[in-house]
């Protein structure tokens, strides 16, 4: 999906209002310095591409993020403010359902959500130079 035509300011507002809080809740009890940010993004469409991938695509050691509260609200925000987004996600969801067995918070999942927090922070500051 090409995120170029999304309403970035509304997605940002939704993130600041509630999605960010859900990410913090998920990470509660984890030190902010525990994980290094290894995933980066260069502009807002790129950031949303990476956020979409990390949130909804199962990875080795963490197959369960798509059922978390922050993921449900992320899906809602992208569907509402990115034209045509929801129509592109059918195949992705079928794959996700096969991968999803139990909802267990592993260290790998915590690391992945830490990466997500970094991507969202970067999304919110699009004019900053890439580090």
């Amino acid at each position: 999906y090409d995120f170029t035509n999304c309403d970035f300011e509304k997605i940002k507002a939704a993130y600041l209002s509630t999605i960010s809080k859900d990410l913090i809740t998920y990470m509660s009890g984890t030190k902010s310095t525990e994980f290094n940010n290894t995933v980066s993004c260069s502009n807002r469409p790129h950031c949303l591409t990476e956020i979409q991938s990390l949130t909804f695509n199962p990875t080795a050691g963490c197959a369960s993020l798509a059922k978390e509260m922050f993921a449900m609200k992320t899906k809602a925000a992208l569907a509402i403010w990115c034209p045509g987004y929801s129509e592109t996600q059918i195949n992705a969801t079928q794959a996700m359902k096969k991968a999803r067995k139990s909802k267990v918070t592993t260290n790998k999942c915590l690391e992945q959500v830490s990466q997500l927090q970094g991507l969202w922070r970067r999304f919110n500051r699009p004019l900053l130079k890439q580090q």
């Epitope: 509304k10 509630t18 798509a66 899906k75 809602a76 569907a79 509402i80 929801s86 059918i90």
Partner: antibody
Framework: QVQLVQSGAEVKKPGSSVKVSCKSS????????INWVRQAPGQGLEWMGQ????????TYNGNFKGRVTITADKSTSTAYMELSSLRSEDTAVYYC???????????????WGQGTTVTVSS | EIVMTQSPATLSVSPGERATLSCSVS???????LHWYQQKPGQSPRPWIF???NLASGIPARFSGSGSGTEFTLTISSLQSEDFAVYYC?????????FGGGTKVEIK
């Protein structure tokens, strides 16, 4: 304007199933989660589950032990809630409710259907 | 499962008086995930307050919400006849979504 219109009242026998519909209009049906909430006579509200019509993704309340199935038909902008193995305690008003971001970007159930009364009696 | 406990179950108030409704949450949640709904007999619930303290569209300023963590409050500064109803708090912090048992505000 956003509207959610539900199917009519039902009377069912214990052990049978009921399927309630919720037809949406006035917004992009595929892009908003639809929730189902029930209310037994004189009681509070109980969340049953939700569906994202765009891809069929669902989340259920485990308290219903697999008796609830929520589906959606994008061609008619209609969501369905089916409850099986009915018992007298399932007598309630069943509501569908859209969830979305309000003007302050808080996420909540912003539009509700009018409710469908389901009576379970032998 | 997060348990929402509302008190009192019934609040008898005279028109013009102040009403304070409480919602206690079994584990701490973000204020952005606590909402209030109003329901009148024979009607569907209506969104009333979003994110602890933000009034839904068209809700009069005599209503206010506050709180954080596990304790939240809905206050009606001066009750009008149309305010007599049941008010429910609800959390959107974790699944399953849960509601409080409701507080019925009735005419004294």
């Amino acid at each position: 304007q956003v509207q959610l219109v539900q199917s009519g009242a039902e009377v069912k026998k214990p052990g049978s199933s009921v399927k309630v519909s919720c037809k949406s209009s006035g917004y992009a049906f595929s892009s908003y989660w639809i929730n189902w909430v029930r209310q037994a006579p004189g009681q509070g509200l109980e969340w049953m589950g939700q569906i994202f019509p765009g891809d069929g993704d669902t989340t259920y309340n485990g308290n219903f032990k697999g008796r609830v199935t929520i589906t959606a038909d994008k061609s008619t902008s209609t969501a369905y809630m089916e409850l099986s193995s009915l018992r007298s305690e399932d007598t309630a008003v069943y509501y569908c409710a859209r969830s979305g971001f309000d003007y302050g970007y808080f996420y909540a159930m912003d539009y509700w259907g009018q409710g469908t009364t389901v009576t379970v009696s032998s | 499962e997060i348990v929402m406990t509302q008190s009192p179950a019934t609040l008898s108030v005279s028109p013009g008086e102040r009403a304070t409704l409480s919602c206690s949450v079994s584990s701490s949640i973000s204020s952005s995930n606590l909402h209030w709904y109003q329901q009148k007999p024979g009607q569907s619930p209506r969104p009333w307050i979003f994110g602890t303290s933000n009034l839904a569209s068209g809700i009069p300023a005599r209503f206010s919400g506050s709180g954080s963590g596990t304790e939240f409050t809905l206050t009606i500064s001066s009750l009008q006849s149309e305010d007599f109803a049941v008010y429910y708090c609800q959390q959107w912090s974790s699944y399953p979504l849960t509601f409080g048992g409701g507080t019925k505000v009735e005419i004294k």
